[in-house]
Interface confidence: medium
């Protein structure tokens, strides 16, 4: 079975059940339902999943049985629409149930919430978790899938199965360990951080497909796979891109069973053809399915073939450039992108796409000119400033990061971005700026050749978080403009924003700067977030405040927290010293 199966199945649900097996089928249906109905209790979802699974089994036994010929969207949508509290819990989302497929599924997709109003996941004591794990392992793992899926409605479903497998392995190993906490907590921290990163990366893929279309996603995939598999032929890369696009289109569209099945087929194809794809795949291909697919997705770039000829011969000097371009624009541009990307693992994917766009724009203009060759002869010279801009930006920011350290670097970005887009909500500015600041520890340690792909492609993922959160409640035309005009120019667009001179400063509210003794019991990370929230609010009150003024206030604030957390009567200290701090800050900032 290739990814492009064309064989008809009488029953799609039976086909997927047989392909995936009962365990994966149930897990994927649970993920799908939790990603659609994010507020439903766990027990309700489990009940729906069990009903769907029992039905699938009847179809496996007899594909001609009643309703077995219905599409998965019809079956799943009908099941979701049986939820009694749909109107009360989800409001207008209930109107989706009045629609027919495929409109009903589209309607459900549009109501996915990137920032659902759900309580923060609090980690119980290790003994409590281990007891729950031993008492009912299956329910414990289902709960994990449910809680992640409902908070991350675009999480890449087959990859979530991989996370769940690791989650199970962590508990299996550590609940038997002498020091359970020392064994388990670092593993859970790692899974949490990797999970957040995986969710954000997939969210960008879905945004790319949904907001900018298949062509944009395919261009991204050509560039990335050509960097990763520089020895593969163009036709091979095109094949992988076509199949990968199908997989991600399915997952982003809620077709999780098809997506997981096709991802497995793609991994199988890659491993069967690794000789013509990459020399780095051997270890990945020896692993079990979930690990194999994950490993392939993360595999390091293969070595570039020796003695690759100059690109100019085919794409600038050849007399056939306009002819080749006219005959099949996307294939010719795809070849250009492939050839450029396989030679430049040191460039970010978004930079490669900007270069391809520049090349395309030049050919569009020049191939209609009197002397096309004369017109496009210097096209590669136009690439120089496009390459230098991210190089310089990364150099400057890595120097700043090395000078300040992560926390203070995040603060510098908080101030920078609050001044650019002060209308954005404070929690969003804090979350996004903290993540932008993590680029330092993630990428600045790399040698020059790896810095740009690490940094700029990571920034694309983080800025997409800003874009999807802002889309839910748009408050800034500047954010909307940077998010919607061009996927590959989002980062340069935000970088180019200056202080928003039209912003009317926020009214001063002492309550925003009132702190209590509970801050003392917070983790270091949570304490940082409190301080960074205050910093954003300060900038919103006084957007023209200088770095020095803000630094002085933040230093005073840090000293105030430290002092009161050491005091015998903490609450009194926070009340009295807090008033003094607010007064001193107002004076320092001229509020």
């Amino acid at each position: 079975r290739g990814v492009f199966r064309r064989d008809a199945h009488k029953s799609e649900v039976a086909h997927r059940f047989k392909d995936l097996g009962e365990e994966n089928f149930k897990a994927l249906v649970l993920i799908a339902f939790a990603q659609y109905l994010q507020q439903c209790p766990f027990e309700d979802h489990v009940k729906l999943v069990n009903e769907v699974t029992e039905f699938a089994k009847t179809c496996v036994a007899d594909e001609s049985a009643e309703n077995c010929d219905k599409s998965l969207h019809t079956l799943f949508g009908d099941k979701l629409c049986t939820v009694a509290t749909l109107r009360e819990t989800y409001g207008e989302m209930a109107d989706c149930c009045a629609k027919q497929e495929p409109e009903r599924n589209e309607c459900f997709l549009q109501h996915k919430d990137d920032n659902p109003n759900l309580p923060r996941l609090v980690r119980p004591e290790v003994d409590v978790m281990c007891t729950a794990f031993h008492d009912n392992e299956e329910t414990f793992l289902k709960k994990y899938l449910y809680e992640i899926a409902r908070r991350h409605p675009y999480f890449y479903a087959p990859e979530l199965l991989f996370f769940a497998k690791r989650y199970k392995a962590a508990f299996t190993e550590c609940c038997q360990a002498a020091d359970k906490a020392a064994c388990l907590l670092p593993k859970l921290d790692e899974l949490r951080d990797e999970g957040k990163a995986s969710s954000a990366k997939q969210r960008l893929k879905c945004a790319s497909l949904q907001k900018f279309g298949e062509r944009a996603f395919k261009a991204w995939a050509v560039a990335r796979l050509s960097q990763r598999f520089p020895k593969a032929e163009f036709a091979e890369v095109s094949k992988l891109v076509t199949d990968l696009t199908k997989v991600h289109t399915e997952c982003c569209h809620g077709d999780l069973l098809e997506c997981a099945d096709d991802r497995a087929d793609l991994a199988k194809y890659i491993c069967e053809n690794q000789d013509s794809i990459s020399s780095k795949l051997k270890e990945c291909c020896e692993k079990p399915l979930l690990e194999k697919s994950h490993c392939i997705a993360e595999v390091e770039n293969d070595e570039m073939p020796a003695d690759l000829p100059s690109l100019a011969a085919d794409f600038v000097e050849s007399k056939d450039v306009c002819k080749n371009y006219a005959e099949a624009k996307d294939v010719f541009l795809g070849m250009f992108l492939y050839e450029y990307a396989r030679r430049h693992p040191d460039y970010s994917v978004v930079l490669l796409l900007r270069l391809a766009k520049t090349y395309e724009t030049t050919l569009e203009k020049c191939c209609a000119a009197a002397d096309p060759h004369e017109c496009y002869a210097k096209v590669f010279d136009e690439f120089k400033p496009l390459v230098e801009e991210p190089q310089n930006l990364i150099k400057q920011n890595c120097e700043l990061f090395e000078q300040l350290g992560e926390y203070k670097f995040q603060n510098a970005l908080l101030v920078r971005y609050t001044k650019k887009v002060p209308q954005v909500s404070t929690p969003t500015l804090v979350e996004v700026s903290r993540n932008l600041g993590k680029v330092g520890s993630k990428c600045c340690k790399h040698p020059e050749a790896k810095r740009m792909p690490c940094a700029e492609d990571y920034l694309s993922v983080v800025l997409n978080q800003l874009c999807v959160l802002h889309e839910k409640t748009p408050v800034s035309d500047r954010v909307t403009k940077c998010c919607t005009e061009s996927l590959v120019n989002r980062r340069p667009c935000f970088s180019a924003l200056e202080v928003d001179e039209t912003y009317v400063p926020k009214e001063f509210n002492a309550e925003t700067f009132t702190f209590h003794a509970d801050i003392c019991t917070l983790s270091e990370k949570e304490r940082q977030i409190k301080k960074q929230t205050a910093l954003v609010e300060l900038v919103k009150h006084k957007p023209k405040a200088t770095k020095e003024q803000l630094k002085a206030v933040m230093d005073d604030f840090a000293a105030f927290v430290e002092k009161c957390c050491k005091a015998d009567d903490k609450e009194t200290c926070f009340a009295e010293e807090g008033k003094k701090l607010v007064a001193a800050s107002q004076a320092a900032l001229g509020l």
Epitope: G2, E233, A235, E236, S238, K239, T242, P309, D314
Partner: nanobody
Framework: EVQLLESGGGLVQPGGSLRLSCAAS????????MLWVRQAPGKGLEWVSV????????YYADSVKGRFTISRDNSKNTLYLQMNSLRAEDTAVYYC????????????WGQGTLVTVSS
């Protein structure tokens, strides 16, 4: 030694159909992407369609999209081009070729088969 042998060309009226075949030998056909190119009288080479070694994906020049279908049978080492709704401007010698390993160069071609579309 690599050999590509095209057949199926001929004279056909506008709006008519033809099916070209290309028998391949001397290389591992099922690991090679293949394409059809054509050369109209007095004109340069124009590529028509590409097919991946596995049968998908396929690509078509804008001028033939929706009218021509490329396919292959790896068990028979044969490449096909189904041409429908033929037009006068499709008149050309059609060659099958092994797809370029990367650049805009074609590794091997056949001798070609002439397709004439005329009333």
């Amino acid at each position: 030694e690599v050999q590509l042998l095209e057949s199926g060309g001929g004279l056909v009226q506008p709006g008519g159909s033809l099916r070209l075949s290309c028998a391949a030998s001397g290389f591992t056909f099922d690991t090679s992407s293949m394409l059809w190119v054509r050369q109209a009288p007095g004109k340069g080479l124009e590529w028509v369609s590409v097919i991946h070694q596995s049968g998908t994906p396929t690509y078509y020049a804008d001028s033939v999209k929706g009218r021509f279908t490329i396919s292959r049978d790896n068990s028979k080492n044969t490449l096909y081009l189904q041409m429908n709704s033929l037009r006068a401007e499709d008149t050309a010698v059609y060659y099958c070729a092994k797809f370029p390993s990367s650049r805009m160069k074609f590794d091997y071609w056949g001798q070609g088969t002439l397709v004439t579309v005329s009333s």
